[in-house]
């Protein structure tokens, strides 16, 4: 999901002029940056979130806020500190003139400042059938565990908590942070104010139409009667949850954010902090028929982002728009004509549609999974959600062509049994943001903190790329893809796996002098090959070289073009075994695939040879896909021959551990 490359406006105010009366300049001459929402109508100028550097204490935050007020007053400006943040992010929320931004950016401890902006409910006024495994009947949907050990926080509108569908299941907290409704003649009708939140609470834990019928919920009001809120209000809500968690630690927490606004660095940062504190966050991908990476919190990598599908597993169309899509979406879930509690009366039901409803389904599934296995980490939960999803059921033609390969073809489902999945080696595919077209442009894909990067591949629609490599960054391996001259840009594709007690390293062989090609293998005792990457500096690998074939009996070896450096990902983990599986097609073909068989998990996916007519390789579930240029442009010479190379692994250790538990 979105990393550092959000498509939002960043105004870096390079402040070199020394302001009068400013005691401290920013440390080391670093310049604080200013951010604002890329969608103009959603901007809320005049209110700003001042984010301070990570280690800033509350007293320093308060002092910085006071200093801003004093310096503003000296210039004849009134300011109002609306909130001082601590617990999640250090900083403060201030109401002030935009004229003071230059001044504020020069204050000590300031990391960046973000202008406040709007967030919106993501609903428009068969679901259990889709997520229920075949052995249950949806009309008698009695889940094996109703999520009773889990608390689900809902950040939404007010809700009718005594509706028969949710009575006693929802505790309405006293938290409320909402903007005034728009329009002078707006009439606050209670049932309308409660509509969105009541419906979603019913979808999560309703006694008749809920997914996790045993889950208890807590609601925070961050959306007004028109379904509109602010980034700052949502931030304060997330902070409230963190403080509640510290004051009274309970079991697993799920936070449902059925709202979306423009890309927000600060909202994504807050989500990251809360996720790293052990909270599972689930959010709506957004209803804008657009790339979810352009919205927050959908673009936060640590959040489980959910798109919406209908009863036919097709992406949901909502008027002229529809569900968001793209690499920032983790999976889809039912989001069209979802029946749930209606705030029109205490026993009424209504159907609503949107990615909010889809997110509520996944929050319910997450609650049930966590209730069955309370020790699951966020990474384990996400991997399980992906693993148990219905695969390849969505008609991708609905998505824009350039987004199809990036959008996961997954529809959320409950596991057939909430226990016993521990033996599985779980992996997922993470796509980077697009590198952009410049000659030296690179793209980076990262795994979550407790996942292992087991392989790295790259993809370019133009075919002009210079491969990929795994490299260490901040003590963790990342996958970096390289664009080539004349290329339109590349993607890096990381294969991220759950491999407890793993010790992984990358072995590299420089380009070979001989014509045999470059090879590298895992030479350390007990290390197995989990992935191969190749990277080259030349603009165009020789396309007329014969393809390199792997010598028989060399499964622990990566092979590549003689002009490329080859990188082998070698891992040692208890009971880990891997094998190489290849599928070569002598005639040119646009797509070559090879899949791992039942019980084995795809960890590595690469192409032989790495010549320039190969667009790249990537994993889709348990299948390795190698894409080549259009057949008509390559002719049928030997250069058209492509081999898809899959590395399939399994963990005997995980299997044994799971058998011992049963």
């Amino acid at each position: 999901q979105e990393d550092e490359d959000g498509d939002y406006e960043e105004l870096v105010l390079a402040l070199r002029s020394e302001e009068d009366g400013l005691a401290e300049a920013p440390e080391h001459g670093t310049t604080a940056t200013f951010h604002r929402c890329a969608k103009d109508p959603w901007r809320l100028p005049g209110t700003y979130v001042v984010v301070l550097k990570e280690e800033t204490h509350l007293s320093q935050s308060e002092r910085t806020a006071r200093r801003l007020q004093a310096q503003a007053a000296r210039r004849g400006y009134l300011t109002k500190i609306l909130h001082v943040f601590h617990g999640l992010l250090p900083g403060f929320l201030v109401k002030m003139s935009g004229d003071l931004l230059e001044l504020a950016l020069k204050l000590p401890h300031v990391d960046y400042i973000e202008e406040d902006s709007s967030v919106f409910a993501q609903s428009i006024p068969w679901n259990l059938e889709r997520i229920t495994p075949p052995r249950y009947r949806a009309d008698e949907y009695q889940p094996p565990d109703g999520g009773s050990l889990v608390e689900v926080y809902l950040l939404d509108t007010s809700i009718q908590s005594d509706h028969r569908e949710i009575e006693g299941r929802v505790m309405v907290t006293d938290f409320e942070n909402v903007p005034e409704e728009d329009g002078t003649r707006f009439h606050r009708q209670a049932s309308k104010c409660d509509s969105h939140g009541t419906h979603l609470a019913g979808v999560v834990s309703g006694r008749d139409a809920g997914v996790a019928k045993g889950a208890s919920m807590r609601s925070l009001r961050v959306l007004n009667c028109q379904g509109k809120g602010t980034v700052s209000g949502t931030l304060i809500g997330l902070e409230f949850i963190r403080k509640s968690q510290l004051v009274q630690p309970v079991g697993p927490l799920v936070v449902l954010l059925p709202l979306a606004g423009g890309y927000s660095r600060v909202l994504n940062a807050a989500c990251q902090r809360l996720a790293r504190a052990g909270v599972v966050l689930v959010t709506a991908a957004g209803n804008f028929r657009d790339d979810a990476c352009l919205y927050s919190p959908a673009s936060a990598p640590e959040v489980i982002t959910v798109g919406a599908t209908n009863a036919q597993d097709q992406p949901v169309t909502l008027g002229t728009l529809g569900t968001n899509f793209g690499r920032c979406v983790d999976l889809f879930a039912p989001g069209e004509d979802i029946i749930g509690a209606s705030s029109d009366c205490s026993t009424c039901f209504v159907s609503q549609s949107g990615t909010s409803q889809a997110a509520a389904h996944v929050a319910g599934i997450a609650a049930m999974m966590l209730s069955a296995e309370p020790e699951l980490t966020l990474a384990e939960l996400r991997q399980r959600l992906i693993h148990f999803s219905a695969k390849d059921v969505i008609n991708e033609a609905w998505f824009p062509e350039d987004q199809r390969v990036l959008t996961p073809n997954l529809v959320a489902a409950l596991p057939p049994s909430t226990h016993g999945a521990g033996w599985q080696l779980f992996c997922r595919t993470v796509w980077s943001a697009h590198s952009g077209p410049t000659r030296m442009a690179t793209a980076v894909a990262r795994c979550a903190p407790d996942e292992e990067l087991l392989s790295c591949s790259s993809f370019s629609r133009s075919g002009k790329r210079r491969g990929e490599r795994m490299e260490a960054q901040g003590g963790k391996l990342v996958c970096r893809a390289h664009n080539a001259f004349g290329g339109e840009g590349v993607y890096a594709i990381a294969r991220c796996c759950l491999l407890p007690q793993a010790n992984c390293s990358v072995h590299t062989a420089p380009p070979a002098e001989a014509s045999m090609g470059t090879r590298v293998h895992c030479h350390q005792q007990g290390h197995v090959l989990t992935g191969c990457s190749s990277h080259w500096e030349v603009e165009d690998l020789g396309t007329h070289k014969p393809p390199v074939l792997r010598p028989r009996g060399q499964p622990n070896q990566c092979v590549g073009h003689r002009e490329a450096s080859i990188h082998a990902s070698c891992c040692h983990a208890p009971g880990l075994e891997c094998k190489v599986k290849e599928h070569g097609i002598p005639a040119p073909q646009e797509q070559v695939t090879v899949a791992c068989e039942e019980g084995w998990t795809l960890t590595g996916c690469s192409a032989l040879p790495g010549t320039s007519h190969v667009l790249g390789a990537y994993a889709v579930d348990n299948t390795c896909v190698v894409r080549s240029r259009d057949v008509s442009t390559t002719g049928s010479t030997s250069e058209g021959a492509v081999t898809a190379v899959a590395i399939c692994c399994r963990s005997r250790h995980l299997a044994q551990a799971s058998q011992e538990l049963q």
């Epitope: 008698e140 009718q160 005594d162 028969r164 309405v172 209670a190 008749d208 205490s346 026993t347």
Partner: antibody, heavy 115, light 107 residues
């Protein structure tokens, strides 16, 4: 602990009105409404209706429509049931109970309608 | 309205006996059925929630089963304090409706 405490017994003449109160404590009152159930001497239980502490909305059994009014006062966590135009067959013990699920009951209020 | 029919309307049993009371709904009520125990002059007390869930504090000799239209309350070993009237109640749809009651007497 969770408790519903009702007002004391009432003796009324036919045609009069009665208002029974029910004070809730030990839980978040807005998370549940209050149901009213009555039991005539030697008879079974009859659900009369439900009222919301959250927004004051109510849901009445058809038999009661027009004669009964259920209200709440969230500030005092108290629910009320008023029955007008009393008849002798309204003589019963009136119970308040929590929510639609009736998981907690008040001790009951005896209402006697007699000339 | 949904009709709830309880049987038997009364039964005589001895301490230690296994007692079964049934309740039938006139239409599918899923599992939204509660069982109550009422002693003379007292308010009803919830015994079983959602057809089979026993609230905290209710002795384990009481159990409930069933789904859809047919439900059962079982007292595995009748104790002296169990002699009372038992009611089933559906809350799948409004108005909530009760069975006519089953009186359990000492033989």
């Amino acid at each position: 602990q969770v408790q519903l405490v009702q007002s004391g017994a009432e003796v009324k003449k036919p045609g009069a009105s009665v208002k029974v109160s029910c004070k809730a404590s030990g839980y978040t009152v807005t998370s549940y409404g209050i149901s009213w159930v009555r039991q005539a001497p030697g008879q079974g239980l009859e659900w009369m209706g439900w009222v919301s502490f959250y927004n004051g909305n109510s849901n009445y059994a058809q038999k009661l429509q027009g004669r009964g009014t259920m209200t709440t006062d969230p500030s005092t966590s108290t629910a009320y049931m008023e029955l007008r135009s009393l008849r002798s067959d309204d003589t019963a013990v009136y119970y308040c109970a929590r929510g639609y699920s009736l998981d907690v009951w008040g001790q009951g209020t005896t209402v006697t309608v007699s000339s | 309205d949904i009709q709830m029919t309880q049987s038997p309307s009364s039964l005589s049993a001895s301490v230690g006996d296994r007692v079964t009371i049934t309740c039938r709904a006139s239409q599918n009520i899923n599992n939204w059925l509660n069982w109550y125990q009422q002693k003379p002059g007292k308010a009803p007390k919830l015994l079983i929630y959602g057809a089979s869930t026993r609230p905290t504090g209710v002795p384990s000799r009481f159990s409930g089963s069933g789904s859809g239209t047919d439900f059962t309350l079982t007292i595995s070993s009748l104790q002296p304090e169990d002699f009372a009237t038992y009611y089933c109640q559906q809350w799948d749809d409004t108005p909530n409706t009760f069975g006519q009651g089953t009186k359990v007497e000492i033989k």
